[in-house]
Structure formats: structure tokens, C-alpha cells
């Protein structure tokens, strides 16, 4: 199942990037997992997952640093609390779980590029 | 003549972006001209220009917004004052223009992302 | 290498049980989100179960109540406890998690 995803996103200066996630959906499914794995160095990380009803909000746990939407076949992934040391390689995994059959697609990957901001100066 | 630079660069929160440009000479030039463009919605404008003697200071115009030393066939180019807005492919191009024959290179781009920062909070 | 290696499955009279294991090289089961699926002869994949990274687990319909699925962080090993199993449970049982694509899968075959 072929999963798009941008190749390039910003954080903004308060560490938030937002991405959309699209996927070409096979067949009508109702229930929806998309995960959110974070590649660095060869490394991969699992950052944040969610399992959602189409149609239904996406709900993440409640310390995650996601939170997203979806509208049909897109989910609108927004993650929070970015540090420089966070830039990667952010790849969208989607599993159609529900009902049968099951479909896999995994996304090449968004680029997110995070900038420490400057310390403001202390007001004295 | 082959000229190298990074792909992609982040401009530090203050706005100030450096890079190497490299070239493979193919002779003994004593007289360098680097010129760095930036090309953005296939729009190309100069951002800058020096000429060096080499073993000697790239001397850029006084109101430039670049700076650089030079060491071989290394030029290290800053440029300082970005906003988000001039985030775009910047790319440098080197001629040896002295002694003949003249040669130019010019290389891929260096992709150069710019975030402005968060206004710091007004101390009253 | 990252790879998942599925182990366990059989045959097995109806009401019977089974217990799957798969286990991975070069990843940490613990750190991810980990599901096991299933392709019945002639049929598409079907999603069984998922046990995310903070240990929560969730079931299809099919299966709640029969299926157990758990993990060895230690041993870095998933698995699938298959209870009063059905005919309609047989099939080729796989695990995924991360950015691996399936195992090889396990043969579970259930007859009357």
C-alpha cells in the first residue's frame, strides 16, 4: 500500500512540525493504526502510534509528543517538544487493521530539520 | 571544473548559514573569483561576490551580507542576516581567473533552511 | 540485520492450544509497537493482535477472549498464546513490528 509523506519539513521555532500523512487506501477500511517512527544514524525509534475509527479523532496516549487528525485518507500529524537533536528522518507507517484484509504501507520518510532557538535575554 | 558543496545547511536561529565550497583546480591560479546565487521558484539572484589572490582574505563589499576565508581550494563562506524568506538553493561558482586559461565551475546548491525565531517576550 | 523469526505453530485438534513465538535480531521488541497477523489458505492478511510499546494490547473480534498476546523483553521474544482454537484459525501466523516487514511466518493448522 503506497504511504506519501513530504520529503522535507521544518520545526518551527518552538519545536512543532507538522506533516501530512497520505495513504492510498485498497479497500474500505474502518480502523486505522498509523505510527510514527523516527530514523537517525541507522537507528530507528518508535515516536508515537495511534489506532482510530475513520471518521474519529486519532487519540495518542496521553504523554505522547503527537497528535493529529485525519479526513478520509490523510491524517495530519503534528509533533511537539522538538530539539535540535531530534532532527531525522520521520517515516509514517499505516496499517489498515480492520476489516480483513489487513494492508502494510510504510512512507519514505519526511526530513524534519530542528533549530535550538536563541535564549532570550534575561529581563533584569 | 568540479565544483562541491553541502546539500542542505541550517541557518542558525540568529540567521547565519556557513558553508564550504570546494573546487578541484585544474591549474595554479593566483586570481579566484566566488560568486554565491540563490535560486528560488527558478528565479536566480547574486548574493554576493569576491575576488582573492590566493594565500590572501575574500574581501566582499563593504553592505555584504557574506563573509569568508579561503585555505587551498577551500572557500568558507558565511551569510548572515537570513529570514525564513531567503530560505532557497544557494549556489557557488568559482572562476580562476588568473593566470589563463580562464576556468568555471559551479556547483549543485546548498540548500539553506531559515526559521525565524520566537520574539522574546517584552521585560516590563 | 533486522529480522523476525516466527516459531511454534502446528497441528492441532479443534479446542486445542498453541503457543507462537517470534523472535527478533537487531531491534528491541520492547521499543516498539508490535502486531501479529494471519493469512488463512486463499485469503488476504488479517490483523490479530497488537501489543504497543508501553504494553497495551488489543484483539480482533475473532479472537478476544481465545488469544493472548505478550512479550519477553529479556529474552526479546513476542508471543501469541492460541487457546480453544477453531477450524477458522488456521492459516499462516506472522509477526511485524517497526520498519521490518513479516517473518517467514508459522503454520497453524486446526482440524476436527
Known amino acids: 500500500m503506497h504511504v506519501a509523506q513530504p520529503a522535507v519539513v521544518l520545526a518551527s521555532s518552538r519545536g512543532i512540525a507538522s506533516f501530512v500523512c497520505e495513504y492510498a487506501s485498497p479497500g474500505k477500511a474502518t480502523e486505522v493504526r498509523v505510527t510514527v517512527l523516527r530514523q537517525a544514524d541507522s537507528q530507528v525509534t518508535e515516536v508515537c502510534a495511534a489506532t482510530y475509527m475513520m471518521g474519529n479523532e486519532l487519540t495518542f496516549l496521553d504523554d505522547s509528543i503527537c497528535t493529529g487528525t485525519s479526513s478520509g485518507n490523510q491524517v495530519n500529524l503534528t509533533i511537539q517538544g522538538l530539539r535540535a537533536m531530534d532532527t531525522g528522518l520521520y517515516i509514517c507507517k499505516v496499517e489498515l487493521m480492520y476489516p480483513p484484509p489487513y494492508y502494510l504501507g510504510i512512507g519514505n520518510g519526511t526530513q524534519i530539520y530542528v533549530i535550538d532557538p536563541e535564549p532570550c535575554p534575561d529581563s533584569d | 571544473m568540479h565544483v562541491a558543496q553541502p546539500a542542505v545547511v541550517l541557518a542558525s536561529s540568529r540567521g547565519i548559514a556557513s558553508f564550504v565550497c570546494e573546487y578541484a583546480s585544474p591549474g595554479k591560479a593566483t586570481e579566484v573569483r566566488v560568486t554565491v546565487l540563490r535560486q528560488a521558484d527558478s528565479q536566480v539572484t547574486e548574493v554576493c561576490a569576491a575576488t582573492y589572490m590566493m594565500g590572501n582574505e575574500l574581501t566582499f563589499l563593504d553592505d555584504s551580507i557574506c563573509t569568508g576565508t579561503s585555505s587551498g581550494n577551500q572557500v568558507n563562506l558565511t551569510i548572515q542576516g537570513l529570514r525564513a524568506m531567503d530560505t532557497g538553493l544557494y549556489i557557488c561558482k568559482v572562476e580562476l581567473m588568473y593566470p589563463p586559461p580562464y576556468y568555471l565551475g559551479i556547483g549543485n546548491g546548498t540548500q539553506i533552511y531559515v526559521i525565524d525565531p520566537e520574539p522574546c517576550p517584552d521585560s516590563d | 540485520q533486522v529480522q523476525l523469526q516466527e516459531s511454534g505453530g502446528g497441528s492441532v485438534q479443534a479446542g486445542g492450544s498453541l503457543r507462537l513465538s517470534c523472535a527478533a535480531s537487531g531491534f528491541t521488541l520492547s521499543s516498539y509497537t508490535m502486531t501479529w497477523l494471519r493469512q488463512a489458505p486463499g485469503k488476504g492478511l488479517e490483523w490479530v493482535s497488537t501489543i504497543n510499546s508501553g504494553g497495551s494490547t488489543s484483539y480482533a473480534d475473532s479472537v478476544k477472549g481465545r488469544f493472548a498476546i505478550s512479550r519477553d523483553n529479556a529474552k526479546n521474544i513476542l508471543y501469541l498464546q492460541l487457546n480453544s482454537l477453531e477450524i477458522e484459525d488456521t492459516g499462516m501466523y506472522y509477526c511485524?513490528?517497526?520498519?521490518?516487514?513479516r517473518g517467514q511466518g508459522t503454520q497453524v493448522t486446526v482440524s476436527s
Open positions: 511485524q513490528g517497526g520498519l521490518t516487514q
